[in-house]
């Protein structure tokens, strides 16, 4: 419905607390370098203005669009040109171009300091002294580092963050209570951010049709008892929600997400038997719960797919009448029967089916032409199955750290031009597929593994897009969303790569490594491994393992030494010399 004042409408729908939180997230995701205090000031000004519009929707400027109001507010920041450079040029544009301009300047890898966790007592004092500021700061720090974080979900994280401090700051052992909860929130938050980043990339780079196809497949797996019309309605609504959030329309997104959760719960009888518990929860928990709900049981006695999609004489007629609806039905029927397939595999099958119909429906004998279409699916299904089997075996043999190292070597040889921090981050995340998915039974492995890999490879794609250095990465990232993983899997060693000049400084280590956490120490060693491969791409895995074993032993030895710094200096020189000789550098 049309509202006289959009800002008043959203303020009333969401309530003041959520309104302020969402505006803060929106501003922090756009102006990622601005200090916290500046954002709070802008949010307070917007909130005061919204209240005047609630009181009188006809008041001055209350009829303006949210983009106009928020954009005007962002463009009042005095240091825009100095801090953001060419992003300041956005302010010369009119809406909707101005918002598009701000969106294009969102930085997936902003140059911000790592978030260092203070002592528990310091955090608890800050929480008690000013709970509201403490929680706002959390929203701000996450939003500016993750400019595509799903805003209504971030409100859910903030609620859990608050609950953790409320409980644990009163506990006898504050640290034992709080730290595991914060670790869990951090890990879940990173995963949530990466999943949402893929949704936004899907919408922005491949369009609404691609996102809708993904949603049809996923929702059909999750709600196999729901009718096609019901799934289609959910897909349309979900697409609107994510289009809004990815477009920076966070108030509309949160409002529409709440409406969707309400609809799902009111109609759960025709959607899924698994929603009952979710629907008893408060709004933020309810939406999160629905998004994560397990797949419902498949209806008994589903007929064979072949009848409607291969054997029927009306296949081409039905296809021609409404191509996307017919393909949507195919995807729905296939996905609801196959919770054991990854979404990307289901989309590959649907694409193969579409390509076959395009060709065959123009042939002299269409039916004969497409009669064997399901046979074309077999290799597409077997490829990820075999890959997962091999990699799970390797993971079980090596353990997570060494499995990550194997992937680091593999991916550095494929795309050695990519920056070392990106290769380390992406390969570490690729390696986590082992602990995440290999424990599952066969029927759950593929959806877990391949859909997770799609999320991780999207991280590589968005980081690479910022500073493109490899044509092969660009090709795999842009040609086909659903074939990204097979594209990267198929890459061999890049024979055109000219090895990096050897720099001993890259392999110089100091006593500070001894005080690092195990994770940070691993990252240091993995960084060295990537650099080694960049210097000597033809090194065998045995040679690389030997050098890495020497490096681990060197760190262990020097961290036990009385004079650590001298040990690192003297033994380090010898280690570099031995490694150079071993690799022929």
């Amino acid at each position: 419905d049309a509202h006289k004042s959009e800002v008043a409408h959203r303020f009333k729908d969401l309530g003041e607390e959520n309104f302020k939180a969402l505006v803060l997230i929106a501003f922090a995701q756009y102006l990622q370098q601005c200090p916290f205090e500046d954002h709070v000031k802008l949010v307070n000004e917007v909130t005061e203005f919204a209240k005047t519009c609630v009181a009188d929707e006809s008041a001055e400027n209350c009829d303006k669009s949210l983009h106009t109001l928020f954009g005007d507010k962002l463009c009042t920041v005095a240091t825009l040109r100095e801090t953001y450079g060419e992003m300041a040029d956005c302010c010369a544009k009119q809406e909707p171009e101005r918002n598009e301009c701000f969106l294009q300047h969102k930085d997936d890898n902003p140059n911000l300091p790592r978030l260092v966790r203070p002592e528990v007592d310091v955090m608890c004092t800050a929480f008690h002294d000013n709970e509201e500021t403490f929680l706002k700061k959390y929203l701000y720090e996450i939003a500016r580092r993750h400019p595509y974080f799903y805003a209504p979900e971030l409100l859910f994280f903030a609620k859990r963050y608050k609950a953790a401090f409320t409980e644990c700051c009163q506990a006898a052992d504050k640290a034992a209570c709080l730290l595991p909860k914060l670790d869990e929130l951090r890990d879940e938050g990173k995963a949530s951010s990466a999943k949402q980043r893929l949704k936004c990339a899907s919408l922005q780079k491949f369009g609404e049709r691609a996102f809708k196809a993904w949603a049809v497949a996923r929702l059909s797996q999750r709600f196999p008892k729901a009718e096609f019309a019901e799934v289609s309605k959910l897909v349309t609504d979900l697409t609107k929600v994510h289009t809004e959030c990815c477009h920076g329309d966070l108030l509309e997104c949160a409002d529409d997400r709440a409406d969707l959760a309400k609809y799902i719960c009111e109609n759960q009888d025709s959607i899924s038997s698994k929603l009952k518990e979710c629907c008893e929860k408060p709004l933020l928990e309810k939406s999160h719960c629905i998004a994560e709900v397990e797949n419902d049981e498949m209806p008994a006695d589903l007929p064979s797919l072949a009848a409607d999609f291969v054997e029927s004489k009306d296949v081409c007629k039905n296809y021609a009448e409404a191509k996307d609806v017919f393909l949507g039905m195919f995807l729905y029927e296939y996905a609801r029967r196959h919770p054991d397939y990854s979404v990307v595999l289901l989309l590959r099958l649907a694409k193969t089916y579409e390509t076959t119909l395009e060709k065959c429906c123009a042939a002299a004998d269409p039916h004969e032409c497409y009669a064997k279409v399901f046979d074309e699916f077999k290799p597409l299904v077997e490829e990820p199955q075999n890959l997962i089997k091999q990699n799970c075996e390797l993971f079980e043999q090596l353990g997570e750290y060494k499995f990550q190292n194997a992937l680091l070597v593999r991916y550095t040889k494929k795309v050695p031009q990519v920056s070392t921090p990106t290769l380390v981050e992406v390969s570490r995340n690729l390696g986590k597929v082992g602990s995440k998915c290999c424990k599952h039974p066969e029927a759950k492995r593929m959806p877990c593994a391949e859909d997770y890999l799609s999320v991780v490879l999207n991280q590589l794609c968005v980081l690479h897009e910022k500073t493109p250095v490899s044509d092969r990465v660009t090709k795999c990232c842009t040609e086909s969303l659903v074939n990204r993983r097979p594209c990267f899997s198929a890459l061999e060693v890049d024979e055109t790569y000219v090895p990096k000049e050897f720099n001993a400084e890259t392999f110089t280590f100091h006593a500070d490594i001894c005080t690092l956490s195990e994770k940070e120490r691993q990252i240091k060693k993995q960084t060295a491994l990537v650099e080694l491969v960049k210097h000597k791409p033809k090194a065998t895995k045995e040679q690389l393992k030997a050098v890495m074993d020497d490096f681990a032993a060197f760190v262990e030895k020097c961290c036990k030494a009385d004079d650590k710094e001298t040990c690192f200096a003297e033994e380090g020189k010898k280690l570099v010399a031995a490694s150079q000789a071993a690799l022929g550098l």
Partner: nanobody
Amino acid sequence: QVQLVESGGGLVQVGGSLRLSCAASGRTFSNYVMGWFRQAPGKEREFVAYIHWSGSSTSYADSVKGRFTISRDNTKNTMYLQMNSLKPEDTAVYYCTADQYASTLLRAAGEYWGQGTQVTVSS
């Protein structure tokens, strides 16, 4: 100076097992990466396995993976090679070697070497 002495070689049937030992004397054994190489008549010296000084890391040639196990006992200054499921192509003189670095050892450039012990696998 480190002296290395191999023992445990001999004649064995296909599918049989042997355990080689390498006793070290001289400098601190536990500071060294220890390894085994082998050389069949008319062939190059070939890497078999190594074990780092703490025993925490090992590496094997593909040809022996799953059949041979390298281990060490720093209290006895001794390294071992347990060889199972032996094949005719395992016939060779087996050499024990030591160096500060696995990467040096791997390219057959270890600082110290033993005299070798003959292993013959007959069919």
